[in-house]
């Protein structure tokens, strides 16, 4: 499996909420013996592989945020944790894989890594990840609503997230 | 080669917690998870959980959750499993255990084991 | 949780002679083409080691007098000529299914 992140940059305002989108691409072996974690953290431009580096997203580490379930089943982040911080990770049927932030501040600005780790038989098979950029901005130059980049070159045209 | 090298003997009261080491060497320690075991006198093996060392994430028998807390350091490759609220049953030893090559699903590596012993 | 009964819980045999240990699952144990049983040999004062996997397999270094079969529900460990260092107790176990669990183990001794 693959993981897709269907935008590259996010560039939002100020007290905007956002939510930052990777998918779970090809076939996805539903044995029983097969579970996926999934988790969110920020990382750092410059380095030798993107997201190699985990660090917190508003305090929050990767463990805190994972969701850990068979296949494409939907999973929710436990609520109280994350929502206090204005966070919430979800993953949906159709390999969906998302994190939501509320409130921006120019403080969240930064690259964003999605992990996807799939679990066979308590071993980690494989590990995918995906990297986008989230650029948070005040003042006049600020858009009104969140303004998303496609990752793919033959897409051009921005995509006003809803 | 690859070596599990556990902690010594411990001897614990009703109600105390234990913490036992398990300090891995010869292959990459983040690219397997790593089990415990637990085998009380003249009994038989029984799975308490495993540890995800990359990720720090922990997978417990139902029969635990809430009394084991499995963790690791990888700066010194080694995990740490924790027993709360010990009681007579919990007399055994513990052993630590990886998966084959490849984390092929069965124990192909063993610690030498640490008997807990709890006791009033 | 998978429920793993051995048979018999003790075994006394004379050098030379066969053996044979017995391993019933309470639900399949077979995933795709592959048995997710295991059989582990535990001498005194030792941890368990490897002996066959995945039913029918003999780990790297372990003597071929040792061999394994089955499917499904019901496993076998044989040996073909028992020697006095077989002494301890073998213990059969699946990892098909989150709890891996254990048979109760079987004792062999030397006659």
């Known amino acids: 499996f693959k993981v897709a992140t269907p935008y590259s940059l996010y560039v939002c305002p100020e007290g905007q909420n956002v939510t930052l989108t990777c998918r779970l691409l090809g076939p996805v072996d539903k044995g029983h013996d097969v579970t996926f974690y999934k988790t969110w953290y920020r990382s750092s431009r410059g380095e030798v592989q993107t997201c190699s580096e985990r660090r917190p997203i508003r305090n929050l580490t990767f463990q805190d945020l994972h969701l850990h379930h068979g296949g494409h089943q939907a999973a929710n982040t436990s609520h109280d944790l994350a929502q206090r911080h204005g966070l919430e990770s979800a993953s949906d049927h159709h390999g969906n894989f998302s994190i939501t932030m509320r409130n921006l501040t120019l403080l969240d600005s930064g690259l964003y890594c999605c992990l996807v780790v799939e679990i066979r038989h308590h071993h980690s098979e494989h590990r995918v990840h995906g990297a986008m950029e989230l650029q948070v901005q005040t003042g006049k130059d600020a858009p009104s609503n969140c303004v998303v980049y496609p990752s793919s070159s033959q897409d051009s045209e921005n995509i006003t997230a809803a | 080669q690859v070596q599990l090298v556990q902690s010594g003997a411990e001897v614990k009261k009703p109600g105390a917690s234990v913490k036992v080491s398990c300090k891995a060497s010869g292959y990459t320690f983040t690219d397997y998870w790593m089990h415990w075991v637990r085998q009380a006198p003249g009994q038989g093996l029984e799975w308490m959980g495993a540890?995800?060392?990359?990720?720090?994430?922990?997978s417990y028998n139902q029969k635990f959750k809430g009394r084991v807390t499995m963790t690791r350091d990888t700066s010194t490759s080694t995990v740490y499993m924790e027993l709360s609220s010990l009681r007579s049953e919990d007399t055994a030893v513990y052993y630590c255990?990886?998966?084959?090559?490849?984390?092929?699903?069965?124990?192909?590596?063993w610690g030498r084991g640490t008997l807990v012993t709890v006791s009033s | 949780d998978i429920v793993m009964t051995q048979t018999p819980l003790s075994l006394s045999v004379t050098p030379g002679q066969p053996a044979s240990i017995s391993c019933r699952a309470s639900?399949?144990?077979?995933?795709?083409?592959?048995?997710?049983v295991h059989w582990y040999l535990q001498k005194p004062g030792q941890p368990p080691q490897l002996l066959i996997y995945r039913a029918s397999n003999l780990e790297s270094g372990v003597p071929d007098r040792f061999s394994g079969s089955g499917s499904g529900t019901d496993f076998t460990l044989k040996i073909s000529r028992v020697e006095a260092e077989d002494v301890g107790v073998y213990y059969c176990q699946q990892s098909n299914e989150d709890p891996y669990t254990f048979g109760q183990g079987t004792k062999l001794e030397i006659k």
């Open positions: 639900e399949s144990v077979d995933s795709y083409v592959n048995s997710f």
């Open positions: 255990a990886r998966w084959g090559i490849y984390g092929n699903p069965w124990f192909a590596y």
């Open positions: 540890i995800e060392t990359s990720l720090n994430y922990p």
